[in-house]
């Protein structure tokens, strides 16, 4: 119904979302030597970050490396840090994947292997595969509420996408429930042909699109957002080109008057909100 | 070879980085009531920041006020905070520069200056130049991988700009390596003019624009990211109208049972990562 | 004066945001089981935190729940945990609403009030309103300044919203001061006809409009930012659909060994800055 | 000035324990990895045991699970608790302060001899 003569304008749009859910997180730590489970329970402040613009973050999957503090310590061993003597180490040398600033001396590690002594906060992370399955693969049964308003302002018209009288027990569905804005994550996933399980072990970036299709005539008046996802992230990449989607951060703090850090590696689905529409009128 | 009477689509984009590399950072304490530089190790959890959207952060320089507590002390001595008496100083108020607020009295900073005192974070923040040279000038050997899959989903068409056979140890060259998606940070600079060193002094804001110009048609089939750089903040701002990038964030902890914080300025490169283009297609 | 036939450019915009200001906060703590009213400084670091894009969030107001630690405890009470037995509990049941996991156990809260059991962050966040004025209420004097660098690549002409002279005491004004970027929050609101003081309560999500109207013909030269000022949430929510803006964050520490954390309800303005604009040139 | 001062040496017999204590001054302690060496009549100087600003320890393979070295940060101190003390223990050992980042010694105390003999 929308004519070709219509006066087509860009939508402004703003956006907040509210994840909800809590994970039981079985972490595997060493206590005198033996390996041990813990339970632990996340809740929202430990798997999401207050996050701007149109993106919110889920918190999938983790190593943690405990007590860093800056020494001298050797670097963990691989093909590229291992050495047999002091000749196979370089003073001053800072190879990009390392963590540190070689001093120049080939040490003991562990056993009989021997790497290059390096300056960094030690002991250094380990080199290691993400755990499987991920540590808060019961992610998938968090939902997100997304709130969207948005504004014509050359129409002067405004509206958002949660009206009075919704059920807000309501979950998302594509042909029950296409107008309900709280989403289940796995629900997300099944509708772009993923696993979500798979892609929370080394986490992924996923779009949300909401299409706003609006006729602001008298006559033909309708505006309603129609959502649909998009898998963003590379499913297949190179080993090299660091697949998913990861970082590092710390929490830093003080022992003994010693500044240390505990060095978490995060691997995690970035969801991005993407709104697009136009509001045509005479 | 793209005709007048193609249709164009707008690119959806999802953009992803990795920074890689260390600093070593010489920082100066006082032992002794002599100044000593001691030696630290600055790796990504240190001075990059998970970032949202289209952005990432790389911080060159900082100052340091570490053990401040809610006291009442004197402010720091400016122009402004100077005091000769208690005349000088009004009960309740809040300079809009200032740190804290005013008790009424003019109390002794050191030796026979004096300030009005405050309550505040305390010791309050001194005012003071950004070292010279950074502290991370060394950041101009990290390096930014940019991972950039793109969408023309009018043409249901999906590509990015890492094809599979990558060499991954590449570098990017205007001229040698135009595809390569690996950046120097100082080479981004070295192509807009600017010098690395002098930036990362103040901070400031680099555009890093992502050009696709694709061609959709079965015949003509071409589409491909062009990478080129723009300073985006302001060179030569009047001091007053804060050069450069900055933010202060405070590390909080506790000692003793008092709540206590490190109040960190972080000066640094905001990138700012621009991708446009349009698929062409009959 | 800008003809049908000029060629329109897209902008390209780089923000920069300052905030200033401090506040005094009067917290209540409890003591010896009396309630007492403490009075904190709260300055940029304390409120606002490191954004990126084109957004800067100021906290207005807060809960507190000190000194949470993983272990089982009782559930806040409201209709949906209140139980009289074991029956009324379910073990490993995660409702969406709580914060842990039942253990299948009736237990007492306080009194005869009686919970189900859960393994959470304990104690349990209790479920309570915003605190009434907010405690950040005197955010409305704090001001921001908004650096806003702009370029129209085709015309290859670069501009900014802060030019040489600027008097950098002035405050923006609709009438009197409308080019000045530096703005107080209070008359954010007041300009959208909102009340900052009841927003602080519970947050909210403001627009700030920077619109660039720019011919860039020799003849007919002009470019410069007009600003205009959008409520972007919804004011009239329904309690169940999160009114307001607001986040969970955590700060961790250890006591004892133990990893504890304060988990802190933030309630506060999101600002988006939304820069458009064309450029027309024969 | 800086000062390393070792105490707590002493006459002990086979089996028995000792503590060494080491007081710094005139340095920024929690910047340095503090170590405890020792040198027997007519030997090298060798390394005993390390401790880190943050508290990693590194034991010389002869005393490992008899020495346990110690440090508190506050009180700028640092110790050495020794259990089943044998005679070849005996020799002066030595307090020595090094830069975390350092591979050698910045500083060394005067030495206190211990005495391990029936």
């Known amino acids: 119904s929308d004519k070709l003569y219509q006066r087509k304008e860009p939508v402004i749009s703003s956006v907040h979302t509210k994840v909800k859910g809590i994970a039981e997180v079985k972490e595997e730590i060493v206590e005198n030597g033996v390996k041990k489970l813990v339970h632990s329970v996340f809740d929202t402040a430990d798997y999401t970050f207050p996050l701007q613009g149109n993106s919110f973050f889920v918190m999938t999957n983790f190593l943690k490396t405990e007590g860093q503090e800056q020494r001298l310590c050797p670097e963990y061993p691989t093909r590229r840090t291992l050495c047999s003597s002091d000749r196979g180490c370089k003073k001053g040398w800072m190879d990009p994947q390392s963590k540190g600033i070689q001093t120049g001396r080939c040490v003991v590690y562990e056993g009989n292997q021997k790497t290059c002594e390096v300056s960094a906060w030690c002991p250094i992370e380990a080199v290691e595969e993400a755990p499987r399955p991920a540590l808060l693969n019961s992610a998938e049964n968090f939902t997100v509420l997304i709130k969207n308003n948005i504004d014509f302002p050359g129409h002067n018209y405004t509206t958002r996408n949660i009206l009075p009288g919704l059920n807000i027990t309501c979950t998302f569905h594509k042909t029950q429930n296409p107008q309900c804005p709280i989403f289940r994550l796995g629900d997300i996933f099944r509708e772009t042909g993923d696993n979500f399980s798979d892609v929370a072990i080394q986490g992924g970036i996923m779009g949300i699109e909401i299409y706003w299709d609006c006729n602001l005539d008298r006559w033909f008046h309708h505006c309603h957002p129609k959502y649909s996802f998009r898998r963003l992230d590379d499913k297949t990449t190179n080993v090299s080109l660091y697949p998913g989607y990861n970082f590092r951060y710390a929490k830093y703090y003080k022992e003994n008057n010693v500044e240390k850090r505990t060095l978490i590696k995060v691997f995690g689905i970035r969801f991005d909100i993407l709104v697009f529409g136009t509001g045509g009128k005479f | 070879s793209d005709k007048l009477y193609q249709r164009k689509e707008p690119v959806i984009s999802s953009v992803h980085t990795k920074v890689k590399g260390i600093a070593e950072v010489k920082e100066e304490i006082v032992e002794n009531g002599v100044k000593k530089l001691v030696h630290s190790v600055f790796d990504t959890a240190d001075y990059t920041f998970p970032l949202q959207g289209n952005s990432f952060f790389v911080m060159t320089n900082f100052l340091k006020t570490e053990g401040q507590e809610q006291r009442l002390c004197p402010e720091y001595p400016t122009r402004r905070t100077l005091c000769s008496s208690d005349r000088g100083c009004k009960k309740g108020w809040m300079d809009p520069q200032s740190k804290g607020i005013q008790t009424g009295r003019c109390v002794v900073y050191e030796g026979n200056q004096k300030t009005c005192e405050v309550s505040a974070w305390c010791p309050i923040e001194a005012v003071e130049e950004a070292p010279r040279p950074a502290l991370l000038n060394s950041a101009e050997n990290f390096t930014v991988l940019i991972k950039n899959n793109i969408d023309f989903p009018g043409h249901n068409y999906t590509t990015r700009n890492i094809l599979p056979g990558l060499n991954i140890t590449c570098t990017f060259h205007k001229t040698q390596n135009p595809q390569c998606p690996i950046f120097r940070l100082g080479d981004i600079f070295r192509e807009t003019g600017d010098n690395f060193s002098d930036v990362a002094i103040q901070g400031g804001i680099m555009g890093i624009e992502i050009y696709w110009d694709c061609n959709l048609d079965r015949w003509f089939h071409h589409c491909h990211p062009k990478y080129s750089f723009r300073r985006l903040d302001d060179k030569t701002t009047n001091v007053s109208l804060y050069p450069g990038y900055n933010f202060r964030y405070a590390k909080y902890y506790k000692e003793n049972n008092v709540e206590k914080r490190t109040l960190i300025k972080v000066f640094g490169i905001r990138f700012d990562i621009l991708v446009f283009g349009t698929g062409g297609k009959f | 004066s800008d003809k049908l036939y000029q060629r329109k450019e897209p902008v390209i915009s780089s923000v920069h945001t300052k905030v200033k200001g401090i506040a005094e906060v009067k917290e209540e703590i409890v003591e010896n089981g009396v309630k007492k009213l403490v009075h904190s400084v709260f300055d940029t670091a304390d409120y606002t935190f490191p954004l990126q894009g084109n957004s800067f969030f100021v906290m207005t107001n807060f809960l507190k729940t000190e000194g949470q630690e993983q272990r089982l405890c009782p559930e806040y009470p409201t209709r949906r945990t209140l139980c009289s037995s074991d029956r009324g509990c379910k073990k490993g049941w995660m409702d969406p609403q709580s914060k842990g996991i039942q253990t299948g156990r009736c237990v007492v809260y306080e009194g005869n009030q009686k919970t189900c059991e859960v393994s959470a962050w304990c104690p349990i966040e209790a479920v309570e309103e915003a605190p009434r004025p907010a405690l950040l209420n005197s955010a409305e004097n704090f001001t921001v300044l908004i650096k806003n660098n702009i370029d129209f690549p085709g015309h290859n002409y670069t501009t900014r919203n802060i030019l040489p002279g600027l008097n950098i005491t002035c405050t923006f004004h609709k009438t009197q001061n409308p080019q000045c970027p530096i703005f107080r929050l209070g008359d954010i609101f007041r300009e959208t006809g909102d009340n900052f003081s009841d927003v602080a309560i519970q947050g909210g999500i403001m627009g700030i409009e920077i619109y660039w109207d720019c011919n860039l013909d020799r003849w007919f030269h002009h470019c410069h930012p007009k600003y205009s000022f959008r409520r972007l949430d919804d004011k009239t929510t329904n309690v169940s659909l999160y009114p307001g803006y607001n986040f969970r964050y955590a700060k961790y520490y250890k006591e004892n060994n133990v990893e504890k954390r304060t988990l802190i309800k933030v309630f506060g303005i999101r600002f988006d800055i939304l820069v458009f604009g064309t450029g027309g040139k024969f | 000035e800086v000062q390393l001062v070792e105490s707590g040496g002493g006459l002990v017999q086979p089996g028995g324990s000792l503590t060494l204590s080491c007081a710094a001054s005139?340095?920024?302690?929690?910047?340095?990895?503090m170590s405890w060496h020792r040198q027997a009549p007519g030997k090298q100087r060798t390394l005993v045991a390390d401790?880190?600003?943050?508290?990693?320890?590194e034991y010389e393979d002869s005393v490992k699970g008899r020495f346990t070295i110690s440090r508190d940060n506050f009180k700028n101190t640092m110790t050495l608790h020794m259990n089943s003390l044998k005679p070849e223990d005996t020799a002066v050992y030595f307090c020595?302060?090094?830069?975390?980042?350092?591979?050698?010694?910045?500083?060394w105390g005067q030495g206190t001899q211990v005495t391990v003999s029936s």
């Open positions: 005139g340095i920024a302690f929690n910047y340095y990895s």
């Open positions: 020595a302060a090094r830069l975390r980042f350092e591979v050698s010694s910045n500083y």
């Open positions: 401790i880190s600003p943050g508290g990693h320890t």
